[in-house]
C-alpha cells in the first residue's frame, strides 16, 4: 500500500506520472474533496496508469450487494473488488476517460473491449453508464448496452425489465432487460461454467450461458 502524505492522486494515471510505476494498491483522493479511497493500479498493461474499478478472479467475494455497497465499493483491491460507483462517477465527469474490459475464459483465451469514451452519471441519475468508440476483440457489438442504462442492484431496481434483473441474475450491473452482459454475476468454477444464465456473462464474446473465469474493468484518462 503506497502513499506519500504530500501527494494527492485522483487516479492511477496521476500516480504513474508522479513516478510510481509499480503495480499495487494506492490511495486516491476524490475530485474536489479530501475523501480517500484505495484502488489497485495496473502500471504495466498497455502503458500503465490504469485504475482498476472491478476485478473477478476466484469467486472469493460476494457480488450480490446493496446499492450503498456498490456506491462506496467493496472487496479487496488486491483481489476481487468493486471500486465504487460514486468515485468513478465523480472521476469520469472531470475529464474524458477510456474504459477497458479485459476478459479470460476457462480455455486460456483472453479478449478485451475498449471504449474510447466512458462516464457514469450521478447517483441522482442512477449511475447511468455512457460508452462510445468500441474497439477490441470481445465482439463488434457492445455487450454492455451503450444506450445509457441505469445501474441496478438487488435493492435498487432500475432496469428495463418487468422482472428484477439484479435479483434474477445476481449482482449490480447496468442491466437492460436484462441484456447481454453481467460481469458481476455468480462466479462458477471450471466445468460448472456453462449453461448458466446468472453467471459472469459477456455475450458477444462467449455467448449467453458461458460464465467467465476472470474479468477486469479499468479506466484511464483519454489523454494519458
Amino acid at each position: 500500500d503506497y502513499k506519500d502524505d504530500d501527494d494527492k492522486f485522483r487516479d492511477c494515471a496521476e500516480v504513474f506520472k508522479s513516478g510510481h510505476t509499480t503495480n499495487g494498491i494506492y490511495t486516491l483522493t476524490f475530485p474536489n474533496s479530501t475523501e480517500e479511497i484505495k484502488a489497485y493500479c495496473d502500471m504495466e498493461a498497455g502503458g500503465g496508469g490504469w485504475t482498476i474499478i472491478q476485478r473477478r478472479e476466484d469467486g472469493s467475494v460476494d457480488f450480490q450487494r446493496t446499492w450503498k455497497e456498490y456506491k462506496v465499493g467493496f472487496g479487496n483491491p488486491s483481489g476481487e473488488y468493486w471500486l465504487g460507483n460514486e468515485f468513478v462517477s465523480q472521476l469520469t465527469n472531470q475529464q474524458r476517460y477510456v474504459l477497458k474490459i479485459h476478459l479470460k475464459d476457462w480455455e486460456g483465451n483472453e479478449a478485451y473491449s475498449l471504449y474510447e469514451h466512458f462516464y457514469l452519471s450521478s447517483e441522482e441519475l442512477n449511475y447511468r453508464i455512457h460508452l462510445k468508440g468500441l474497439t477490441g476483440t470481445a465482439g463488434k457489438i457492445s455487450s454492455i448496452s451503450q444506450a445509457g442504462n441505469d445501474f441496478s442492484t438487488k435493492d435498487g431496481d432500475n432496469d428495463k425489465c418487468i422482472c428484477k434483473c439484479s435479483q434474477m441474475l445476481t449482482g449490480g450491473w447496468w442491466f437492460d432487460a436484462c441484456g447481454p452482459s453481467n460481469l458481476n454475476g455468480m462466479y462458477y468454477p471450471q466445468r460448472q461454467n456453462t449453461n448458466k444464465f446468472n453467471g459472469i456473462k459477456w455475450y458477444y464474446w462467449k455467448g449467453s450461458g458461458y460464465s467467465l473465469k476472470a474479468t477486469t474493468m479499468m479506466i484511464r484518462p483519454a489523454d494519458f
Epitope: 465527469n93 474524458r96 474510447e116 469514451h117 462516464y119 452519471s121 450521478s122 441522482e124 441519475l125 447511468r128 455512457h130 462510445k132 468508440g133 468500441l134 474497439t135 463488434k140 457489438i141 457492445s142 451503450q146 444506450a147 445509457g148
Partner: antibody, heavy 121, light 107 residues
C-alpha cells in the same frame, strides 16, 4: 416527456448575427447529455453546428468555429445559438436536439420542430 | 472530418418490399453510427443508434448493422407511412457528419 422548442427571427440581414433560443421542457439541461444545434440546408443536407454539455463545456464544428457561440441560461432551462457574420449560405432550417452522450458528440434522440432562417437583405 | 457516403439517393418501392440503404465511412467509425427518418415537414427522428440498436418505440421492421466503415440500414417490409428521407450519421469523431440522405418514395 422531453421537448425542445426553437425560437428566433426568421429573417436576418447579411453580415449581422443570427441568434436562436432553444427552450427545453421535461428535462434539466444541467442533469446530463449534450444539447446541440444542427441545421438543414435547402436540398436537405444536415450539418452539426455544436453543443453545450450538461456541465457547460462546448464543442463546435471547426467549419464554424470562428463565428459560433453556444451558451445557456440554466435558470430558464434554455440554450442559445449565436452565429456571427452571416451570409445567404447560412439560410437553413435550424434545429436544437439532445444527444445521448454528455461529454462528446453522439446520436440525437430528441429534436425540436425546427425554425426556418433566411439570410437576405 | 469523416465523410459518410450514402447510397442510393432515391428508392422507388412498393408497399411490402424489402429495402436496403448503405453508408460508407471514409475512415473507421467503430459502431458509432445512427440512422434517422425525416418525414415531410418534420424534424429527423432517431431510429437506430450504435449501428444496430433500435431506438425506443421503433418498429422491428427497421434494422441496422455494420462496424468500421460499412453500414447498412434495412426496412424488411415497407409500409406507406415509411415515405421519408433516411440519413446516416457518424459520431465516432468530431464533428459528427451525416450522409446525404436517401429519399424513399412509394410507387
Amino acid at each position: 416527456d422531453v421537448q425542445l422548442q426553437e425560437s428566433g427571427p426568421g429573417l436576418v440581414k447579411p453580415s449581422q448575427s443570427l441568434s436562436l433560443t432553444c427552450t427545453v421542457t421535461g428535462y434539466s439541461i444541467t442533469s446530463d447529455y449534450a444539447w446541440n444545434w444542427i441545421r438543414q440546408f435547402p436540398g436537405n443536407k444536415l450539418e452539426w453546428m455544436g453543443y453545450i454539455s450538461y456541465s457547460g463545456s462546448t464543442s463546435y464544428n471547426p467549419s464554424l468555429k470562428s463565428r459560433i457561440s453556444i451558451t445557456r441560461d440554466t435558470s430558464k432551462n434554455q440554450f442559445f445559438l449565436q452565429l456571427n457574420s452571416v451570409t445567404p449560405e447560412d439560410t437553413a432550417t435550424y434545429y436544437c436536439a439532445r444527444s445521448t452522450f454528455g461529454h462528446y458528440v453522439s446520436s440525437m434522440d430528441y429534436w425540436g420542430q425546427g425554425t426556418s432562417v433566411t439570410v437576405s437583405s | 472530418s469523416i465523410v459518410m457516403t450514402q447510397t442510393p439517393k432515391l428508392l422507388l418501392v412498393s408497399a411490402g418490399d424489402r429495402v436496403t440503404i448503405t453508408c460508407k465511412a471514409s475512415q473507421s467509425a467503430s459502431n458509432d453510427v445512427a440512422w434517422y427518418q425525416q418525414k415531410p415537414g418534420q424534424s429527423p427522428k432517431l431510429l437506430i443508434y450504435y449501428a444496430s440498436n433500435r431506438y425506443t418505440g421503433v418498429p422491428d421492421r427497421f434494422t441496422g448493422s455494420g462496424y468500421g466503415t460499412d453500414f447498412t440500414f434495412a426496412i424488411s417490409t415497407v409500409q406507406a407511412e415509411d415515405l421519408a428521407i433516411y440519413f446516416c450519421q457518424q459520431d465516432y469523431s468530431s464533428p459528427p457528419t451525416f450522409g446525404g440522405g436517401t429519399k424513399l418514395e412509394i410507387k
